[in-house]
C-alpha cells in the first residue's frame, strides 16, 4: 500500500521542515518540576514500542508506522543501560532499584545496593537504598504507585521496599529462617516502609490472611488471603490515616477519587496481577488509564506537588508468554494512560519520564507491506516452505516441534490473541534482553535526558529535577514547594 | 562477577552526578555547522549497539557494558522510525534516500520518491530526489563516501545515484530494456552524477570492462571486471580531474593521503565487498578507520568545509548471515573509525551524526552472567534440556534441525567465528528488522537530533546545520563556508 | 451470580437447520469469551466454538469438525450467545452446553456452564 | 491442533483409595489444564484450573500436578460422593478436552 500523498517528496520535506521548526523551537526550562511523574512499561524495549505503534495505528485506520504514540511526543531521548550489577541481562528487581533509587543492585533484589545477595536475608541491613519516592514524600510531596501487576511486584516495591528476594510477597513467601532473621515480606513493607497516598493495582491476596475469601472470587480457593501471621494489612493501613479509604472495585474507584474526605486511597483490583486489558471485565476492574487519573486527581490536591509510578507491568507478562498479541494491546493501553496524565497535567510543572526497564528477545522483521498487520505474516515462505510471521522471539514457550519439524502457521492462526509466536529456543517463559532501552521526557528539566547514559540516571534526573535529597541545593527557580 | 566499588552506592551516585553536571553543562551552539560527517551502521540496531559496547569493553579486559562506545559520548540522540513508503521493515536502498535525501522511498529503489517503482526504470525520471551530498558539492564543499561494502552499494548509492533497482551493480546487472529506456547502473552513476572528491570501498569489479582481470586476483576469472559496454570507469574518472589518483590497496591508500598533488582519490580495495573485518589482509586493504583517516586528511583541506559518508556496511551482512561475531566486530571496527574521526575533527565545526538504516531481528538475552562472553551460553538448560546461546536471532540461516531436534552447542562452539546462532524461523538470509534506531549526535546545531523523528529527518537536519538547500536562510552564525 | 440459560434444542431431521440460544446474566456480557461445548449420548465433552470478547473483536474459533457448518455469534444487546447449525447430522445429536470463560492466571478456563439443550438429528 | 491424551478410560476403586488419573498432550500446554467432574444428567463442574489451583468448596481431597506435556489429577482419599467421570481440558491453545475417565466404586 503506497499512499498516494508520500510518493510526493514536498509531504517529507514538508513534515520535516515542520519537524526542525519544532526542534528549534524547543527551549530547555530553567525551573524546577513541582511534580514527578515516571511512566515504566515493563519489558518495553525499542522492538515492543514500533509495534504497539503500528498496532495502534492500525486501530484508528491507519497504516501504522506514521502514526504517534504519546510517549514519541515527548521531545527529549535517551538511552538506558539496564544490566545489573551481576548481570548483564537483568530483572525486574534490579533494576527498579536503579531508575528508582539511583543505585544499582543484584538480580532480584529491590531497594538494596550490590552488597546485598539475592536471598540472603542477612545482607539486607545497612544496604538499603533510598527511592526518589520516598524522598519526594519526605520533601512534603503526596506519592502514589500504579500498576497493572500486584502492587508488591517487583518495579513498583522499588519505590518502598528494601528485600533480598523479589518473590517474599507476602510472608508464605518468606522461609521461616528469613523472618526469623528480621526479614519482612513486600507487602508488609508496602503498609510500613513509609506513608504512600495511593496505592493501585493487584495483589489483594498478599495482605489478608490464609482462609480469607476473596471478594470478587469468594468460590476459587486459591484466590484467596496467604497471611500466615494472621495479619489483616488493608486493616492496618486503614487505621494509620483517618482519610483512608481502600477499594476492589472500579465503581468504587471511580468514587473515593472524587471524594474530597479520601486523603489516602488503596485499591487493589485482582488477588495477584490485574488481568490483561483484554480479559479485563470493565464493570469489575479499572484500566490503567482510570487509575492512572483516579491517583491524578488524588495527588494534584497538595498544592506541594507530588511524585508518581504508573506501570505498565504486564507488557513483559506478554512478551514471557511469548503472546505477542498480549504484550502489544498492554502497551497500547500503558500509552493510552501516559496521553491521559499528559491532558490532566501541565508540562510548565510536571516532569513526565517513560520507560522501560529493559526488553524483551523479540523481533519484527520479514519484510510486510506498510499496513500489514502486525501479527499477520511475512510475504513469501522459508526454506521449509512454511509461513512465518513478522513477529517472532528468540526464546520462549512458543517453540514447538510437530513430527520433528517447524510448524506451519496461518494468518488466522498468527492473528488470535492466544498465539505463540515461535522461537529459536524452547523456554518456559521467554526471557529479558539486554539493549539499551529509551527514556522519553517532557517537563522541567527534560533536556537532562540525553545520550547514553546508565539506568540509575534516571532517578537523579527525577530528584534533580524537583531539588530532592541529594540535589536540595539545586539552584531551579521556582524552587520545588514554593507554590504552597 | 560483582565489581566491589560497584556494591558501595556512592559508586553510582558520583558517577550519576558527574552525568548530570555534564547535562547540565551541554550548551546548543547557534553556530553553522561547516563540516557534517555520517556514520551509517548498516543493519546496526540497539541491540547490536549494546552486544558491540559489551564486546568492544571485554576486549579491553573490563566486564563490558559499564565502557563506552565512542558513539555513546555523542551527547544528544533521538529514535529514527526506519519504515519505507511500501514495507513495514524496510531495505538499505530505501533508507538511504530517506537519511541521505530526506524523502522516504519505495523497498529497493534508491535516490528516488516513492512515486518511482522497484524495477520500472521508466518510473524514474522526474522522480529523483537531491542529496545532502550533492548539495553540499554544490555549495563548494568537499565531498567523500567511505564504506567496506562495494561503493555502488545501496547505502554508499544513496548519496549520488537515482535507481529503481539498488542491485543494478555494473550494466552487467541491468536489463537489456532497461538500459534501452535510459537506465544507468549504479557504477556509471558514481562517476557522472556528480563530482566526489574522495570514494573510498570496495567494487572493482563493476568499474572496468568484462575480462578485466582483477589486479588483487587476477586468476580468479569471477572477480574480474563485469561491464558490458567495454568502458574503464576509473579511467574515464581519473580524466575528470587533473588531481585525480585511484588505489587499489592500502599502500597506495596510505600515500596517496598524503600526497599534497591529489585533489580527488578512488580507492577500491576488492573486487565486490570489502573482507570482514577478522578476513582482512592488514597489508592490502585497509580498516574503516584507515579508510576514514585518508579521507578526512584529503577533505579537510577544503576551507568551505567538507560532507563525508562512512559506513560500516556488513554490520549487516553478518547479521544476515546469522553470525553474530562478525556483526559485533564489523560494529567495533565502525566504531573505531567514529572515534578516529572524533580526533581528526572539531566539534565546534562539524556536526557529526552517527545512525542505523534500519535493524536486525537479532537478540540478546537468556540473563547471563556480567562479565560473560557476548557469544557464550545462556546460564541453565532449555526445555529440550540442551544449552542454548544468549545470542538469537528470529529468523535466518541459522535455524537446523538434526534428528528431528534443535542442535545442542557448547561455549566452544559458540564462540567461534563460523558460528551460526539459531533462529526461530529458517531463512538463506536473516531479516531486518522494523523497529526505530537510534541517531546520535554531535556538534553545531546538534541539539536538533531530539525524539522520535522519521528517519528523513536526519537529512534535513544535515541541510540545515551546515546552511544548504532549502535551508540557505538558515539564520546561523557563523554562516557555512565564512571561513574561505 | 453467574448464570447461563440455553434453548433452541429439540428434534431435527438431518441436513436441516437449527440455531441454539444462550442468555447470560451477571456479569459484563461484552468482557468475556464464551463458547458451545456438545457431549453425545454416552460420549465424551466436546467443544465446537469460540467467540472472544469486545477488547478482541469478537473473534471466532472452530473446531474441525463443524468448521463451515456451523456459526457462533453473539447479541450483546440482549446479553445472547447463538450457534447457527446448518447441515445437520444424525452424529450432531448431544447436548449443547453454553460455557463462558474466566480469566485465571492468563488462561481462558472454561468455568461457568448452562444446564444445556438437547439436540436429536434423526429421521 | 493439541489433542490430550486422558488415562484410564475407566477405572474401579474402593472407598478410601489414592485414585490418579493423567493427561498428556500432544505438545507442551504450559501448565494450562483444568479438571471437571461430571455427574449423570448435569454439566461439568469446574475442580482445578491451571493444574493445581482449587476452586473454593472442591474438597482438599482433590488436587492435580505437572508441567509441560504431562499432568496427573489425584483424589488422596475416594468417597463415595466421586463417583463421576472425569476430564481434563486443555486450554493453552483453543480447547481440548481428555476422552473422560469413569470412576466406579468397586
Known amino acids: 500500500i503506497i499512499p498516494v500523498e508520500e510518493e510526493n517528496p514536498d509531504f517529507w520535506n514538508r513534515q520535516a521542515a515542520e519537524a526542525l521548526g519544532a526542534a528549534k523551537k524547543l527551549q530547555p526550562a530553567q525551573t524546577a518540576a513541582k511534580n514527578l511523574i515516571i511512566f515504566l512499561g515493563d519489558g518495553m524495549g525499542v522492538s515492543t514500542v514500533t509495534a504497539a505503534r503500528i498496532l495502534k495505528g492500525q486501530k484508528k485506520d491507519k497504516l501504522g508506522p506514521e502514526t504517534f504514540l504519546a510517549m514519541d511526543r515527548f521531545p527529549y531521548v535517551a538511552l538506558s543501560k539496564t544490566y545489573s550489577v551481576d548481570k548483564h541481562v537483568p530483572d525486574s528487581g534490579a533494576t527498579a532499584t536503579a531508575y528508582l533509587c539511583g543505585v544499582k543492585g543484584n538480580f532480584q533484589t529491590i531497594g538494596l545496593s550490590a552488597a546485598a545477595r539475592f536471598n540472603q536475608c542477612n545482607t539486607t541491613r545497612g544496604n538499603e537504598v533510598i527511592s526518589v519516592m520516598n524522598r519526594a514524600k519526605k520533601a512534603g510531596k503526596s506519592v502514589g504507585v500504579v500498576t497493572t501487576t500486584r502492587v508488591q511486584h517487583a518495579s513498583p516495591a522499588g519505590a518502598y521496599a528494601h528485600t533480598v528476594n523479589r518473590n517474599w510477597y507476602s510472608d508464605a513467601d518468606v522461609p521461616a529462617s528469613a523472618r526469623q532473621e528480621g526479614c519482612q515480606d513486600i507487602a508488609t513493607q508496602l503498609i510500613s516502609n513509609m506513608d504512600i497516598d495511593v496505592i493501585l493495582g493487584g495483589g489483594r491476596k498478599y495482605m489478608f490472611p490464609m482462609g480469607t475469601p476473596d471478594p470478587e472470587y469468594p468460590d476459587d480457593y486459591s484466590q484467596g488471603g496467604t497471611r500466615l501471621d494472621g495479619k489483616n494489612l488493608v486493616q492496618e493501613w486503614l487505621a494509620k490515616h483517618q482519610g483512608a479509604r481502600y477499594v476492589w472495585n472500579r465503581t468504587e474507584l471511580l468514587q473515593a477519587s472524587l471524594d474530597p474526605s479520601v486523603t489516602h486511597l488503596m485499591g487493589l483490583f485482582e488477588p495477584g496481577d490485574m488481568k490483561y486489558e483484554i480479559h479485563r471485565d470493565s464493570t469489575l476492574d479499572p484500566s490503567l488509564m482510570e487509575m492512572t487519573e483516579a491517583a491524578l486527581l488524588l495527588l494534584s490536591r497538595n498544592p506541594r506537588g507530588f511524585f508518581l509510578f504508573v506501570e505498565g507491568g504486564r507488557i513483559d507478562h506478554g512478551h514471557h508468554e511469548s503472546r505477542a498479541y498480549r504484550a502489544l494491546t498492554e502497551t497500547i493501553m500503558f500509552d493510552d494512560a501516559i496521553e491521559r496524565a499528559g491532558q490532566l497535567t501541565s508540562e510548565e510543572d510536571t516532569l513526565s519520564l517513560v520507560t522501560a526497564d529493559h526488553s524483551h528477545v523479540f523481533s519484527f522483521g520479514g519484510y510486510p507491506l506498510r499496513g500489514s498487520s502486525i501479527f499477520g505474516l511475512a510475504p513469501g515462505k522459508a526454506r521449509d516452505r512454511k509461513a512465518y510471521t513478522v513477529l517472532l522471539y528468540g526464546n520462549g514457550p512458543g517453540y514447538v516441534l510437530k513430527d520433528g519439524a517447524r510448524p506451519d502457521v496461518t494468518e488466522s492462526e498468527s492473528g488470535s490473541p492466544e498465539y505463540r509466536q515461535q522461537s529459536a529456543v524452547p523456554l518456559d517463559g521467554e526471557t529479558h534482553a539486554g539493549e539499551d532501552v529509551a527514556v522519553f521526557a517532557r517537563g522541567p528539566q527534560a533536556h537532562l535526558v540525553h545520550g547514553v547514559q546508565e539506568q540509575t540516571f534516571i532517578a537523579h534526573v527525577m530528584a534533580f529535577a524537583a531539588c530532592l535529597e541529594p540535589y536540595t541545593a539545586c539552584d531551579l527557580a521556582p524552587r520545588a514547594g514554593t507554590t504552597d | 562477577i560483582i565489581p566491589v566499588e560497584e556494591e558501595n552506592p556512592d559508586f553510582w551516585n558520583r558517577q550519576a552526578a558527574e552525568a548530570l553536571g555534564a547535562a547540565k553543562k551541554l550548551q546548543p551552539a547557534q553556530t553553522a555547522a561547516k563540516n557534517l560527517i555520517i556514520f551509517l551502521g548498516d543493519g546496526m540496531g540497539v541491540s547490536t549497539v549494546t552486544a558491540a559496547r559489551i564486546l568492544k569493553g571485554q576486549k579491553k579486559d573490563k566486564l563490558g557494558p559499564e565502557t563506552f562506545l565512542a558513539m555513546d559520548r555523542f551527547p544528544y540522540v533521538a529514535l529514527s522510525k526506519t519504515y519505507s513508503v511500501d514495507k513495514h521493515v524496510p531495505d538499505s536502498g530505501a533508507t538511504a534516500t530517506a537519511y541521505l535525501c530526506g524523502v522516504k522511498g519505495n523497498f529497493q529503489t534508491i535516490g528516488l520518491s516513492a512515486a518511482a517503482r522497484f524495477n520500472q526504470c521508466n518510473t524514474t525520471r522526474g522522480n529523483e530526489v537531491i542529496s545532502v551530498m550533492n548539495r553540499a558539492k554544490k555549495a563548494g564543499k568537499s565531498v567523500g563516501v567511505v564504506t567496506t561494502t562495494r561503493v555502488q552499494h545501496a547505502s554508499p548509492a544513496g548519496a549520488y545515484a537515482h535507481t529503481v533497482n539498488r542491485n543494478w551493480y555494473s550494466d552487467a546487472d541491468v536489463p537489456a530494456s532497461a538500459r534501452q529506456e535510459g537506465c544507468q547502473d549504479i557504477a556509471t552513476q558514481l562517476i557522472s552524477n556528480m563530482d566526489i572528491d574522495v570514494i573510498l570501498g570496495g567494487g572493482r569489479k563493476y568499474m572496468f570492462p568484462m575480462g578485466t582481470p582483477d589486479p588483487e586476483y587476477p586468476d580468479d576469472y569471477s572477480q574480474g571486471g563485469t561491464r558490458l559496454d567495454g568502458k574503464n570507469l576509473v579511467q574515464e574518472w581519473l580524466a575528470k580531474h587533473q588531481g585525480a589518483r585511484y588505489v587499489w590497496n592500502r599502500t597506495e591508500l596510505l600515500q596517496a593521503s598524503l600526497d599534497p598533488s591529489v585533489t580527488h582519490l578512488m580507492g577500491l580495495f576488492e573486487p565486490g565487498d570489502m573482507k570482514y573485518e577478522i578476513h582482512r589482509d592488514s597489508t592490502l586493504d585497509p580498516s574503516l578507520m584507515e579508510m576514514t583517516e585518508a579521507a578526512l586528511l584529503l577533505l579537510s583541506r577544503n576551507p568551505r568545509g567538507f560532507f563525508l559518508f562512512v559506513e560500516g556496511g556488513r554490520i549487516d551482512h553478518g547479521h544476515h548471515e546469522s553470525r553474530a561475531y562478525r556483526a559485533l566486530t564489523e560494529t567495533i571496527m565502525f566504531d573505531d573509525a567514529i572515534e578516529r574521526a572524533g580526533q581528526l575533527t572539531s566539534e565546534e565545526d562539524t556536526l557529526s551524526l552517527v545512525t542505523a538504516d534500519h535493524s536486525h531481528v537479532f537478540s540478546f538475552g537468556g540473563y547471563p552472567l556480567r562479565g560473560s562472553s557476548i557469544f557464550g551460553l545462556a546460564p541453565g538448560k532449555a526445555r529440550d534440556r540442551k544449552a542454548y546461546t544468549v545470542l538469537l536471532y528470529g529468523n535466518g540461516p541459522g535455524y537446523v534441525l538434526k534428528d528431528g531436534a534443535r542442535p545442542d552447542v557448547t561455549e566452544s562452539e559458540s564462540g567461534s567465528p563460523e558460528y551460526r546462532q539459531q533462529s526461530a524461523v529458517p531463512l538463506d538470509g536473516e531479516t531486518h528488522a522494523g523497529e526505530d534506531v537510534a541517531v546520535f549526535a554531535r556538534g553545531p546545531q546538534a541539539h536538533l537530533v531530539h525524539g522520535v523523528q522519521e528517519q528523513t529527518f536526519i537529512a534535513h537536519v544535515m541541510a540545515f546545520a551546515a546552511c544548504l538547500e532549502p535551508y540557505t536562510a538558515c539564520d546561523l552564525a557563523p554562516r557555512a563556508g565564512t571561513t574561505d | 451470580e453467574v448464570q447461563l440459560v440455553e434453548s433452541g434444542g429439540g428434534l431435527v431431521q438431518p441436513g436441516r437447520s437449527l440455531r441454539l440460544s444462550c442468555t447470560a446474566s451477571g456479569f459484563t456480557f461484552t468482557d468475556y469469551y464464551m463458547s458451545w461445548v456438545r457431549q453425545a449420548p454416552g460420549k465424551g465433552l466436546e467443544w465446537l466454538a469460540l467467540?472472544?470478547?469486545?477488547?478482541?473483536?469478537?473473534?471466532?474459533e472452530y473446531t474441525a469438525s463443524v468448521k463451515g457448518r456451523f456459526t457462533i455469534s453473539r447479541d450483546n444487546s440482549k446479553n445472547s450467545l447463538y450457534l447457527q447449525m446448518n447441515s445437520l447430522k444424525t452424529e450432531d445429536t448431544a447436548v449443547y452446553y453454553c460455557?463462558?470463560?474466566?480469566?485465571?492466571?492468563?488462561?481462558?478456563?472454561?468455568?461457568?456452564w448452562g444446564q444445556g439443550t438437547l439436540v436429536t438429528v434423526s429421521s | 491442533d493439541t489433542q490430550m491424551t486422558q488415562s484410564p478410560s475407566s477405572l474401579s476403586a474402593s472407598v478410601g483409595d489414592r485414585v490418579t488419573i493423567t493427561c498428556q498432550a500432544s505438545?507442551?500446554?504450559?501448565?494450562?489444564i483444568a479438571w471437571y467432574q461430571q455427574k449423570p444428567g448435569k454439566a461439568p463442574k469446574l475442580l482445578i484450573h491451571?493444574?493445581?489451583s482449587l476452586q473454593s468448596g472442591v474438597p482438599s481431597r482433590f488436587s492435580g500436578s505437572g508441567s509441560g506435556r504431562d499432568y496427573t489429577f489425584t483424589i488422596s482419599s475416594l468417597q463415595p460422593e466421586d463417583i463421576a467421570t472425569y476430564y481434563c481440558l486443555q486450554y493453552d491453545n483453543l480447547y481440548t478436552f481428555g476422552q473422560g475417565t469413569k470412576l466406579e466404586i468397586k
Open positions: 491451571y493444574t493445581s
Open positions: 460455557a463462558r470463560a474466566s480469566f485465571y492466571y492468563d488462561g481462558k478456563v472454561l468455568a461457568y
Open positions: 505438545q507442551d500446554i504450559n501448565k494450562y
Open positions: 467467540i472472544r470478547n469486545k477488547a478482541t473483536g469478537y473473534t471466532t
